[in-house]
């Protein structure tokens, strides 16, 4: 259970413990959400494929002043091998589609849960 197989990404694949912590944080965000997350801020949708961690960070880093996702941003930066700054975009962004942060987190959570299961059972 040290790492997740079957998932190509630039840079290291997060160990299952780190991935588990990220999922737990996203679960906390979705469960504790009362008002619209990050005041309903919109972010670029991403392809949930290789390089997803950097793409997710590139999308979320453009949301400022939202304490609810600051821990997620820090965790994602640990999974991304290069430095990401606001305004940066990779080919993984679906540049014509913006979604609310809450939906982005929900989609990311579902995908990471799937990756976690794959890592556990393969």
């Amino acid at each position: 259970l040290t790492c997740l197989g079957g998932f190509a990404s630039p840079g290291p694949v997060p160990p299952s413990t780190a991935l588990r912590e990220l999922i737990e944080e996203l679960v906390n965000i979705t469960q504790n959400q009362k008002a619209p997350l990050c005041n309903g801020s919109m972010v670029w949708s991403i392809n949930l494929t290789a390089g997803m961690y950097c793409a997710a960070l590139e999308s979320l880093i453009n949301v400022s002043g939202c304490s609810a996702i600051e821990k997620t941003q820090r965790m994602l930066s640990g999974f991304c091998p290069h430095k990401v700054s606001a305004g940066q975009f990779s080919s993984l962004h679906v540049r014509d589609t913006k979604i609310e942060v809450a939906q982005f987190v929900k989609d990311l959570l579902l995908h990471l849960k799937k990756l976690f299961r794959e890592g556990q059972f393969n």
């Epitope: 259970l1 413990t17 849960k113 799937k114 299961r117 794959e118 556990q120 059972f121 393969n122």
Partner: antibody, heavy 120, light 107 residues
């Protein structure tokens, strides 16, 4: 409402193979892992193994020394547990269990159990 | 494999009593622990997950606590329907392992 319905009781001879089914409803089958648990008469619970229904990837308890095969049929939302080379010590109730690892835990929901009796 | 040592193996108590059951893991299980209640002839029922989170629909008299290797299930005031056998389970790593069980009997 999440439901897990297991196949009926079985009587088998030593050396035979038993295959138990667990049909699920009330959630998307591929969203949760599925596990199998053994409980011998008057004894505690023992994890046998589990499966990710999405990929078919499995994990199992070495105690069963490769005698356990766990499969999942996505087309019928049914998981299966096959136990081969049966011996008298395999007489037990077998349960399937499932759940969201991060929201309720992987054993949040249980089947009703299937009694397998191994006798010559 | 991670060993789960549950104690006591049995206890006698009266309705209204506070009951505490403990589980000790042979290594840190990161709070990936569940508690179950089982009555004779029935499937186990999930009570607590992630060491301290109450499963929906479970009465608030049940609570879980602990971290690292040591975990506790507490029933604050025993109800007649609480007489049963209780099991802990670690799901931090494979193979998942259960405690030996604690039978709660009527005094």
């Amino acid at each position: 409402e999440v439901q897990l319905v297991q196949s009926g009781a079985e009587v088998k001879k030593p050396g035979a193979t038993v295959k138990i089914s667990c049909k699920v409803s009330g959630y998307t089958f591929t969203d949760y892992e599925m596990h199998w648990v053994q409980q011998a008469p008057g004894k505690g619970l023992e994890w046998m193994g589990g499966i990710d229904p999405e990929t078919g990837g499995t994990a199992s308890n070495q105690k069963f020394k490769g005698r356990v095969t766990i499969t999942a049929d996505k087309s019928t939302d049914t998981a299966y547990m096959e136990l081969s080379s049966l011996r008298s010590e395999d007489t037990a109730v077998y349960y399937c269990a499932t759940g969201d690892y991060f929201g309720g835990g992987p054993f949040a929901y249980w089947g009703q159990g299937t009694l397998v009796t191994v006798s010559s | 494999d991670i060993q789960m040592t549950q104690s006591p193996s049995s206890l006698s108590a009266s309705v209204g009593d506070r009951v505490t059951i403990t589980c000790k893991a042979s290594q840190d299980i990161n709070s990936y622990l569940s508690w179950f209640q089982q009555k004779p002839g029935k499937a186990p029922k999930s009570l607590i997950y992630r060491a301290n989170r109450l499963v929906d629909g479970v009465p608030s008299r049940f609570s879980g606590s602990g971290s690292g290797q040591d975990y506790t299930l507490t029933i604050s005031s025993l109800d007649p329907e609480d007489f049963a056998t209780y099991y802990c389970l670690q799901y931090d790593e494979f193979p998942y392992t259960f405690g030996g069980g604690t039978k709660v009997e009527i005094k």
